[in-house]
């Protein structure tokens, strides 16, 4: 059977048929259905939704749809003993308490099982002490406090504003600074866009709104009790003291009305500069402690949440490939939400549902993809990417041999301005070519391509006439596939025009106000942006699963490797004397990148010329493309982060959401001037250059002619 025969009709016609079948009205209907009640991981409601999705995917025509369950560590507030923070006077009397829950949005007042705001996996505790305001609690904020301002956070309760970096990194930084508790709050400067009303009259965060979220530092481990292995029926579980990534101090989130009451009394040092001031009418004094009249008052946290091993359920659907059933293209997104999940995740889940329906329609008409497509509805993403990671741990041997690509499908929108794509360089050309074929949904770009509106609104900083495509970081379910297993991965969604606020999320992120109405009234009334995201995600899956030659261009990897090598060399050259003293050379890395570039170029030439009707040669060339991402995996992992194994990319050690290039070298160089043993520190830099150079060279050789 030739590869075209199996698909019945020509690939271009297939793609058009698939895209034409996607309907905005269906996405809208699915979003409504998925958002009427909360679907918190580990709850009966989320189990019922899993079974509903299983049933509907079967109806849509998938070959099989199974539930995959795991028993993982989750965290919940105590229903009878609520979490809150107090201001206490010298007698220990509580003179102010933070809110116990968010005011429910209109129409949802009688909904039960809305989990109150909490920081998942916070330990229990009732610390009391003076407050220190630590800005965003980034690494550089603590450097400013400790090194420049000589403020000691040891034994203090710190209050940090949400935004800029993943909340787990904030907590880790506070712990390292010696804090005994952390209060996280949403400042209007980061979560209230000027000129927009707060919900329910607009998409801004009201003063009573609070961002939930986990505060783990898992570094890719998955379930904290079973790192590296699936949390199945016969799993050996670590004791809680040995669990991976749990915070050691109590943490609690609040809204800006409550934050105002805590911050307005702050005394001590003035903020070091304007970047430490938010938008509240408070002085943003750093502390420690309250000002004169209130100096005897303290802050007390009351945290009673519990960690519990709980069953979670992934839904895994299979559409078997006609020609290469042992090659898997995966589309996955999570199903669990903090509350209603109007954006996160159900705007993504609704899109996946419609993509499955469209593929199912084609299959019912006799079509099959060339390669197998796996669809996944992940559970417990909000608790640390647990569902996807456990499934990948259980199926790692299959995935590392058969995994072609993973496309992530969390929130379809975080704004309605333009497209945002993060992916492996292997997918750059796929994304460019696909978006040139899709219509832009943007006002003022009628009749123009998505590529054109995207490039105009979000231009590449390096290449004129091309759109920005970002590095993959983490904080979502692609992590295990890309950072641990080395499967080419990508994600796409519609975003806001707010580059400076890249990692803060949209104002109502993880609050009770993330409802269907938020999307339908304010973000995407016509669901045209959702449809566009469905076309991008679905189109990528279609091409990856159906093109005869995999749509990966290894030359784009060569380009970025050179860019990343230049960047890390520039960072190192800030220390010219030490580089000379310790004989630090990047020659091996630049040589490896040069070799990679030449070999990739020759491979691409061969890819144009080879006989595509020879199934053995075709499979051989495709395998070289598929395994290229895998070749960047170091089986030993990064220092102290064994599950981050990709040598070219890892989540930043200072912000899980952000991607870092040549992370091993970057971390070895970070703050190197403060290291007590410079010889040892520069020795580690040299070792990391060696690892990177070797890996790039080894990856290049996988593209060489096989014999």
């Amino acid at each position: 059977k030739s590869s075209n025969e199996a698909t019945n009709i020509t690939p271009k016609h297939n793609m058009k048929a698939f895209l034409d079948e996607l309907k905005a009205e269906n996405i809208k209907k699915f979003l409504y259905n998925f958002t009427q009640i909360p679907h918190l991981a580990g709850t009966e409601q989320n189990f019922q939704l899993a079974k509903q999705i299983q049933s509907q995917w079967k109806e849509f025509g998938l070959d099989s749809v199974e539930l995959a369950h795991y028993d993982v560590l989750l965290s919940y507030p105590n229903k009878t003993h609520p979490n809150y923070i107090s201001i206490i006077n010298e007698d220990g009397n509580e003179i102010f308490n933070t809110s116990l829950f968010e005011p429910p949005p209109p129409g949802y007042e009688n909904v039960s099982d809305i989990v109150p705001p909490f920081s998942a996996f916070s330990p229990q505790g009732m610390p009391e002490g003076d407050l220190v305001y630590v800005n965003y609690a980034r690494t550089e904020d603590f450097f400013k406090l400790e090194r420049d301002m000589k403020i000691n956070c040891s034994g203090k309760i710190v209050i940090a504003r949400y935004g800029k970096v993943f909340r787990g990194n904030k907590v880790k930084n506070a712990q390292l600074a010696g804090a005994k508790g952390v209060i996280l709050y949403s400042d209007p400067a980061d979560y209230f866009a000027p000129g927009v009303k707060s919900y329910p009259d607009g998409w801004n965060l009201p003063g009573g709104g609070v961002q939930r979220g986990n505060i783990l530092n898992l570094n890719g481990a998955g379930d904290p009790l079973t790192p590296g292995y699936p949390a199945n029926e016969y799993a050996y579980r670590r004791g809680i003291a040995e669990a991976v990534g749990l915070p050691s101090i109590p943490v609690h989130p609040i809204g800006y009305y409550d934050a105002q009451k805590l911050l307005e009394k702050m005394g001590g040092s003035a903020p070091p500069d304007s970047s430490w001031r938010g938008s509240l009418k408070v002085p943003y004094n750093v502390g420690p402690g309250f000002t004169g009249n209130f100096s005897t008052q303290k802050v007390k946290m009351h945290i009673h949440s519990t960690n519990e091993v709980t069953r979670i359920y992934n839904v895994i659907g299979t559409l078997r490939g006609a020609v290469e059933p042992d090659r898997y293209v995966i589309l996955g997104g999570h199903r669990d939400s903090w509350v209603f999940g109007g954006i996160d995740p159900q705007s993504g889940a609704a899109v996946v549902h419609e993509i499955v329906r469209s593929f199912g329609t084609l299959k019912k008409e006799g079509w099959r993809p060339r390669r197998t497509i796996l669809f996944a509805s992940w559970d417990a993403e909000e608790f640390g990417l647990l569902g996807s990671t456990e499934w990948a741990e259980e199926n790692s041997r299959l995935l590392q041999e058969r995994g072609v690509a993973y496309i992530n499908a969390d929130s379809s929108i975080e704004g309605n301005y333009t497209l945002r794509v993060d992916c492996t360089p292997l997918m750059y050309s796929l994304v460019h070519n696909l978006t040139k074929e899709l219509k832009s949904p943007d006002e003022g770009f009628e009749g123009k391509s998505l590529y054109e509106s995207w490039t105009k609104k979000s231009p590449s900083p390096e290449f004129s006439g091309m759109p920005r495509i970002s590095k993959l970081g983490s904080g979502n379910d692609f992590e295990v596939f890309f950072q641990r297993l080395g499967i080419a991965s990508g994600r796409a969604r519609y975003t806001k025009n707010w580059e400076t606020n890249k990692f803060s999320g949209y104002p109502l992120y993880h609050s009770v106000y993330e409802t269907y109405e938020l999307v339908e009234k304010f973000y995407d009334p016509m669901f045209k942006y959702h449809l566009t995201v469905a076309q991008v995600r679905g189109g990528m899956v279609f091409e990856l699963a159906n093109s005869i030659v995999l749509p990966f261009d290894c030359r784009d990897y060569a380009v970025v490797l050179r860019k990343y090598a230049d960047k890390i060399y520039s960072i190192s050259m800030k220390h010219p004397q030490e580089m000379k003293t310790y004989s630090v050379s990047f020659d091996s890395l630049f040589s490896a990148v040069k070799n990679f570039t030449e070999i990739a170029s020759k491979f691409s030439e061969r890819l144009q010329d080879f006989d595509k009707s020879n199934p053995i040669v075709l499979r051989m060339m495709n395998d070289q493309l598929m395994f290229l991402e895998r070749a960047f995996i170091d089986p030993l992992g990064l220092p102290d982060r064994p599950f981050y194994r990709h040598v070219i990319y890892a989540p930043s050690s200072h912000n899980k959401y952000a991607g870092e290039s040549f992370p091993g070298i970057y971390d070895a160089l970070f703050d190197i001037e403060s290291k007590v043993d410079p010889s040892k520190a520069w020795g580690e830099v040299k070792r990391q250059i060696y690892v990177a150079a070797f890996t790039v060279q080894a990856a290049a050789e996988t593209l060489s002619e096989v014999a």
Partner: nanobody, 123 residues
């Protein structure tokens, strides 16, 4: 439409107790801080008590602190004022009022009032 209806007033002897109720309709009590305010005969308005929407904080005028307790039953959409150790100077028309700020943490301005219920403390 949005309204507040107070009840439970009456004549009571000094030192005795009374419980006022305020039934809210047309809006969910669960989202709003609520106040009790009173007006003694021939006097101006006096703020009495405030409770946040989630009942996490209660604030009282000094004149009633330790004697009056503000509470609510969000499921019944009803606010209460338990008045103990009543005194002659507590004689007034008692109004419940909605705080204008959804989710407010401290007393602010009122945007909706009831028609009031009369409490007379007399031997």
């Amino acid at each position: 439409q949005v309204q507040l209806v107070e009840s439970g007033g009456g004549v009571v002897q000094p030192g005795r107790s009374l419980r006022l109720s305020c039934a809210a309709s047309g809006f969910p009590l669960i989202s709003y801080g609520m106040h009790w305010v009173r007006q003694a005969p021939g006097k101006g308005l006096e703020w009495v008590a405030f409770q946040t929407y989630d009942a996490s904080n209660r604030y009282y005028a000094d004149s009633v602190k330790g004697r009056f307790t503000i509470s609510r039953d969000n499921s019944k959409n009803t606010l209460y004022l338990q008045m103990n150790s009543l005194r002659a100077e507590d004689t007034a028309v008692y109004y419940c009022a909605r705080d204008r700020i959804v989710g407010g943490r401290v007393p602010d301005a009122f945007d909706i009032w009831g028609q009031g219920t009369m409490v007379t403390v007399s031997s």
